[in-house]
Amino acid sequence: RLSPEYYDLARAHLRDEEKSCPCLAQEGPQGDLLTKTQELGRDYRTCLTIVQKLKKMVDKPTQRSVSNAATRVCATGASRWADVCANFMRRYQSRVTQGLVAGETAQQICEDLRLCIPSTGPL
């Protein structure tokens, strides 16, 4: 649960200035599609893929609708992808859900997770 202690710890790690990441990816006009595919961190690319899938799965993002979609988002694709996806969702589901509910773009959500450090590992 999101306890007061969690907030205190998290606040301690937040800088006062706006958080930003040096990501190179750009989204299309709808905020949905990755239009440039530079060398991105594996987790960042995973994040973008999952968030974009979730956006397509829900008509309107609410805590309930995104949470329901989150239980199905990893079910499609190869088993290796399913494992990567499930691992990502275990760590970040609540934050991804909150970002989607608030109307953040996929890029904003994934940058806010600080996942955009380039990585040479495969997806």
Epitope: L2, R11, Q63, E104
Partner: antibody, heavy 123, light 111 residues
Framework: EVQLQQSAAELARPGASVKMSCKAS????????MHWVKQRPGQGLEWIGF????????DYNQKFKDRTTLTADKSSSTAYIQLTSLTSEDSAVYYC????????????????WGQGTSVTVSS | DIVLTQSPASLAVSLGQRATISCRAS??????????MHWYQQKPGQPPKLLIY???NLESGVPARFSGSGSRTDFTLTIDPVEADDAATYYC?????????FGGGTKLEIK
């Protein structure tokens, strides 16, 4: 100190429009969505909708969608609500309230409210 | 829409006694392990003030006399012991589903 300063009371004719403002200070404007809540005299609270200043995303209560427009100006940390085709049913106090985009920014609820703007619709 | 029904609509409690306010949702307001239910206090001529968020978390600066409990559809705000300054109207509010909704309010009078 967090403050949400709302514009002065409005007196309007039926059929007219009003635009109210909510100027935020004391926090990072883009980390919070701005919500609007209506309260008719002696009545309860009704959620109108919210705007995300980061992305421009808006989410409206269907009941208010047709005659309400929410906007925000990041440069001045100000949110606006415009009501059109006013009727006597729109006579109420309108509150703005902030809500964190992510739960590590603060309590995941509307934690600070403006003082309210009173709108009176009368011929 | 999720309908929030508060009871009682009003109550009078003696100074130093316990006040209990109930909020029942027409459907569950729980998602991914959290109950998206919050409690606010409103005094005449003032905006609402956040007391409890996510069903049971006490907002900073709010006295520990206030507590919240519950999950899914049944929630409770408890004030123990009640003080004179607690005379106000209390609202529950959910944001699990659109549109966000408030309960009808409970007016607390101190005897």
């Amino acid at each position: 100190e967090v403050q949400l300063q709302q514009s002065a009371a409005e007196l309007a004719r039926p059929g007219a429009s009003v635009k109210m403002s909510c100027k935020a200070s004391g926090y990072t404007f883009s980390r919070y969505t701005m919500h609007w809540v209506k309260q008719r005299p002696g009545q309860g609270l009704e959620w109108i909708g919210f705007i995300n200043p980061n992305s421009g995303y808006t989410d409206y209560n269907q009941k208010f969608k047709d005659r309400t427009t929410l906007t925000a100006d990041k440069s001045s940390s100000t949110a606006y609500i415009q009501l059109t085709s006013l009727t006597s049913e729109d006579s109420a106090v309108y509150y703005c309230a902030r809500h964190p985009i992510y739960s590590d920014y603060g309590p995941y609820a509307m934690d600070y409210w403006g003082q309210g703007t009173s709108v009176t619709v009368s011929s | 829409d999720i309908v929030l029904t508060q009871s009682p609509a009003s109550l009078a409690v003696s100074l130093g006694q316990r006040a209990t306010i109930s909020c029942r949702a027409s459907e569950s307001v729980d998602s991914y392990g959290n109950s998206f239910m919050h409690w606010y206090q409103q005094k005449p001529g003032q905006p609402p003030k956040l007391l409890i968020y996510l069903a049971s978390n006490l907002e900073s600066g709010v006295p520990a006399r206030f507590s919240g409990s519950g999950s899914r559809t049944d929630f409770t705000l408890t004030i123990d012991p009640v003080e004179a300054d607690d005379a106000a109207t209390y609202y529950c509010q959910q944001n699990n589903e659109d549109p966000w909704t408030f309960g009808g309010g409970t007016k607390l009078e101190i005897k």
